[in-house]
Interface confidence: low
């Protein structure tokens, strides 16, 4: 057992051009808080997958209001460390996600609103008990500077927090067969309960007599590296040429346990220890029920009709997703017609209509063409709050009073020449091009004739000529 500790040093604009706008303003003061999510191993997991090693949330930082005209500085941070306790062995390799959240303190309906400002992720190797590791991560135009470490909680010690230390019973020496506990020389290593010979650095146990391996190690005593680059010959691992001990594929290789489950070898196969909410041979079945409160944001949980859907979340207005976890951008459905501006007020949607339109969704078109005339046989078209003329051929301008030059827009592609004509325009194409606007090459591959297939390609194979 132990604690992963994260210290945020700064969060602000990164170097280089394109400094981000301050997330806070005089009208909308805000404050930051951070969330860290830890997962064992080096697997590239989705941000939504469980934080199997644990997660923590910081306190909220001081309220910040942008000074008008000033660039976004480093933003004021919450006090203290983020601490993620871990109950089992420290895995040595881990993935992290650190999120910077903004809490808006302005005139929010129903209390403060919060939104994700930046998310950084990484994969690291880290021994417990070591010094603070420093890191800089960038997310878009933002930069996050932080330090982290893993430390064991007494009586655990070691790089994986798996060795146990107890205070000495006698002042001078430890009991028979027990060594002093480095670096705590005044303490003694507790009696070994793991399988005899289990590697103290790469193995650990939770039950007497077992030996479970940290990531990257295998074998009954966790003494065999899963793969060592020095053991790789051009044709793959070969113990004969290099003297390396090459393990056969183990049942836990590639971790068959889904959803953050941990794998342990059994005499015949493997066994998955699943995190809460999952079960099945490979932790592939979600056992979450309404009792686990899976619905966010006030979603109402109802037991599912079949075993594969243990619950269904009925989301309140403004939220969606299987767990009501996504705030609906109701304006993304573009409910305002005719170019109206959509405003999501939380409790309601509003449309701000352009001139010439009215109604809750700007659906009513006020009559723009009344009393308007288009010259030279043009017809008036309503729309956008201002009349528009659709002009007859050869005329243009707002009221169709101007003679149009159909060649002014250079409509002929690839060097074709344009000629005005009573019926519109005509393009005279350059050699090698054809079409009403000279848009088509006569030979699409750019050659005058298709060449023979290059050596090694059979006729009918896909070909690309550069």
């Amino acid at each position: 057992a132990g604690v992963f500790e994260l210290q945020i040093h700064s969060f602000g604009p990164g170097p280089g051009p394109g400094a981000p706008r301050s997330p806070c303003s005089a009208r909308l003061p805000c404050r930051l808080f951070f969330r860290v999510c830890l997962k064992p191993g080096l697997s590239e997991e989705a941000a939504e997958s469980p934080c199997a090693l644990g997660a923590a949330l910081s306190a909220r930082g001081p309220v910040y209001t942008e000074q008008p005209g000033a660039p976004a500085p480093d933003l004021p941070l919450p006090d203290g460390l983020l601490q993620v306790p871990f109950r089992d062995a420290w895995p040595g390799t881990f993935s992290f996600i650190i999120e910077t959240w903004r809490e808006e303190l302005g005139d929010q309906i129903g209390g403060p609103a919060w939104s994700l400002l930046a998310r950084v992720a990484g994969r690291r190797r880290l021994a417990a008990g070591g010094p603070w590791a420093r890191d800089i991560q960038r997310a878009g135009a933002w930069e996050l500077r932080f330090s982290y470490r893993a430390r064991c909680e007494p009586p655990a010690v070691g790089t994986a927090c798996t060795r146990l230390c107890r205070p000495r019973s006698a002042p001078s020496r430890c009991g028979p067969g027990l060594r002093p506990c480095a670096p705590l020389e005044d303490e003694c290593e507790a009696p070994l309960v793991c399988r005899a010979g289990c590697s103290p650095e790469h193995g650990f146990c939770e039950q007497p007599g077992e030996c479970r391996c940290l990531e990257g190690w295998t074998g009954p005593l966790c003494t065999v590296p899963v793969s060592t680059s020095s053991c790789l010959s051009p044709r793959g691992p070969s113990s004969a040429t290099t003297g390396c001990l090459v393990p056969g594929p183990g049942p836990c290789d590639g971790n068959p346990c889904a959803n953050g489950g941990s794998c342990s070898e059994t005499p015949r196969s493997f066994e998955c220890t699943c995190p809460r909410g999952f079960y099945g041979l490979r932790c592939e079945v979600s056992g979450v029920t309404c009792a686990d409160g899976p619905c966010f944001n006030g979603g109402l949980c109802v037991g599912g009709a079949d075993p594969d859907s243990a619950y269904i979340c009925h989301c309140p207005p403004g939220f969606q997703g299987s767990n009501c976890e996504k705030r609906v951008d109701r304006c993304s459905l573009q409910p305002c017609r005719n170019g109206g501006l959509c405003l999501d007020l939380g409790h309601a949607l509003r449309c701000r209509c352009r001139a010439g339109f009215a109604g809750p969704r700007c659906e009513h078109d006020l009559d723009d063409c009344a009393g308007r005339a288009c010259a030279n046989g043009g017809t008036c078209v309503e729309g956008g709050g201002a009349h528009r003329c659709s002009c007859a051929l050869g005329f243009g301008g707002r009221d169709c009073r101007e003679r149009a030059d159909p060649c002014a827009a250079r409509p002929c592609a690839h060097g074709g020449r344009c000629y005005a004509h009573f019926s519109g325009l005509v393009c005279a194409c350059a050699p090698g091009y054809m079409g009403a606007r000279c848009e088509f090459p006569v030979h699409p591959d750019g050659a005058s004739a298709l060449p023979a297939a290059p050596p090694g390609l059979r006729p009918g194979d896909p070909q690309r000529y550069l």
């Epitope: 808080f33 999510c37 469980p50 949330l57 209390g111 966010f296």
Partner: nanobody, 115 residues
Framework: QVQLQESGGGLVQAGGSLRLSCAAP????????MGWYRQAPGKQRELVAV???????NYADSVKGRFTISRDNAKNTVYLQMNSLKPEDTGVYYC?????????WGQGTQVTVSS
């Protein structure tokens, strides 16, 4: 694990009222969806009421019109005002905080409604 501290349970006559309180750490309160669940003897835990960080509320059909959930952001506390209590409201009432993919539970407070 975040500590959620419930209080306010007890023994009450049918038709009476109780007010349950649940205090949560300030670091999560303002962003958590807070809920009350109950578990009657021999039954599954069920949702009673939920209030989101935006203060929108949801209630189980069986308590609509009788129970009211509210939150005091200054005190980091969520309340469940229970009026017109019935014997079937008897059970252990659990406070619940949901934020990100975390779900934290209180220890529970016993509510007994006698007829």
């Amino acid at each position: 694990q975040v500590q959620l501290q419930e209080s306010g349970g007890g023994l009450v006559q049918a038709g009476g009222s109780l007010r349950l309180s649940c205090a949560a750490p300030g670091s999560i309160f303002s962003i958590a969806s807070m809920g009350w669940y109950r578990q009657a003897p021999g039954k599954q835990r069920e949702l009673v009421a939920v209030i989101t960080s935006f203060s929108s509320t949801n209630y189980a059909d069986s308590v609509k019109g009788r129970f009211t959930i509210s939150r005091d952001n200054a005190k980091n506390t969520v309340y469940l005002q229970m009026n017109s209590l019935k014997p079937e409201d008897t059970g252990v009432y659990y406070c619940n905080a949901r934020y990100f993919e975390r779900t934290d539970w209180g220890q529970g407070t016993q509510v007994t409604v006698s007829s």
